[in-house]
């Protein structure tokens, strides 16, 4: 059975969160997708969304968030660049399917951003444009305002992944193996 999981990413200020959400290709390929933050006791807030209909592998940038929807692979890639401490929180991907409620995708991401030096001297890689070569246009797509009341409750943590070293080694609690998350400053 599919389990709702919440994964924890611990990153330093200035680093990049680079995650993916998968969806059923046949059902949702061209549906509009969104990246939301869930704050305790509040409705999920949409931070960025793809165009409607969603375009294949066409990056959409909203501030420091870049969404890329790979229709042909059933994957939504989400990058949050130049992370700030205040970006810490619980995030999720959803698919808009009006008039029905948004469809939540796996996994939820618990992001913890801490202060700390994460770049190389003289590096300008925290600049979104320098790193990603994406035209500085924000999405023309309007993100729907409605959100699902049932996604307000928090999922119980399943495991945690701590990124604490420069070479991006992660230790998972309650898991026998180690995973790595690439961290590019």
């Amino acid at each position: 059975a599919t389990k709702l999981t919440e994964e924890k990413y611990e990153l330093k200020e200035g680093q990049t969160l680079d995650v993916k959400c998968d969806y059923t290709l046949e059902k949702f390929a061209s549906s509009q997708k969104a990246w939301q933050i869930i704050r305790d006791g509040e409705m999920p807030k949409t931070l960025a969304c793809t165009e409607r209909p969603s375009k294949n592998s066409h990056p959409v940038q909203v501030g420091r968030i870049i969404l890329e929807d790979y229709h042909d692979h059933g994957l939504l890639r989400v990058r949050m660049v130049n992370l700030q401490v205040e970006d810490s929180g619980l995030y999720q991907c959803v698919i808009y399917q009006p008039p029905k409620e948004p469809h939540m995708l796996f996994d939820r991401i618990r992001l913890v951003v801490t202060k700390g030096f994460s770049g190389t001297p003289g590096s300008n890689e925290n600049s979104t444009q320098n790193v990603y070569k994406i035209p500085p246009t924000t999405t023309k797509a309007l993100c729907p305002l409605y959100t699902s009341p049932r996604t307000v409750t928090q999922a119980p943590p399943k495991s945690t992944a701590d990124v604490s070293t420069p070479d991006s080694e992660i230790n998972l609690t309650n898991v026998t193996d180690i995973i790595r998350v690439p961290v590019f400053n």
Epitope: E7, G74, F106, V175, D177, I179, P182, F184
Partner: antibody, heavy 122, light 107 residues
């Protein structure tokens, strides 16, 4: 022991289908993507696609779309790759490989099966 | 799709030599690049991930460098057991593609 064990060699006729299995052990099967990579004799590596064993969702490269199906049985920790409408050019060794953590944009393959040779011949 | 071009396609070197293999990406892939070793009749084995990080258990004579479009894989002192074909692989976007491979032989 962390490993991926694949099913044995297959000989198929053109137009037939083949289903290759990949049994995972020693790690949490649903936490990591399973990828399929093939290699024709004397040739390079060709990525076919991926599957998230937790959600069951999968994706494949354009070349294989409509011919490849990736499934899994989470209770026995097995991933399957079925390729249909086989032709002689599909003769290759098919590898399953553990990819990144399901939520992360990590596509390095740190654990591989030994490969399954599929021969397509009339 | 991003094309990965490896050079040379084959090379012959002596035990103890320093060996370099390059991989050129057709567009900027930042550090989204991995290196694999494949011995005859065996499955590939991950050596380097994210351009420069050594996989656990891999000997320190193997290293990787580069970012953007140009990458180098180095064996600091070639050993007889390093006879294999080496592949680079990017994951900057989808689809994932591999270089065509570099066959390494001992002189």
């Amino acid at each position: 022991q962390v490993q991926l064990v694949q099913s044995g060699a297959e000989v198929k006729k053109p137009g037939a289908s083949v289903k290759v299995s990949c049994k995972a052990s020693g790690y949490t099967f649903t936490r990591y993507d399973i990828n399929w990579v093939r290699q024709a004799t004397g040739q390079g590596l060709e990525w076919m696609g991926w599957m998230n064993p937790n959600s069951g969702n999968s994706g494949s490269v354009q070349k294989f779309r409509g011919r490849v199906t990736m499934t899994r049985n989470t209770s026995i920790h097995i991933a399957y790759m079925e390729l249909s409408s086989l032709r002689s050019e599909d003769t290759a060794v098919y590898y399953c490989a553990r990819g990144g953590y399901t939520s992360s944009w990590r596509w390095y393959f740190d654990l591989w099966g030994r490969g399954t040779l599929v021969t397509v011949s009339s | 799709d991003i094309q990965m071009t490896q050079s040379p396609s084959s090379l012959s070197a002596s035990v103890g030599d320093r060996v370099n293999i390059t991989c050129q990406a057709s567009q900027d892939i930042r550090k989204h690049l991995n290196w694999y070793q494949q011995k005859p009749g065996k499955a590939p084995n991950l050596l380097i991930y994210d351009a420069a990080n050594l996989e656990t258990g891999v000997p320190s004579r193997f290293s990787g460098s580069g970012s953007g479009t140009a990458f180098t894989f180095t064996i600091s002192s070639l050993q007889p057991e390093d006879i294999a074909t080496y592949y680079c692989q990017h994951y900057a976007n989808l689809p994932i593609t591999f270089g065509q491979g570099t066959r390494l032989e001992i002189k």
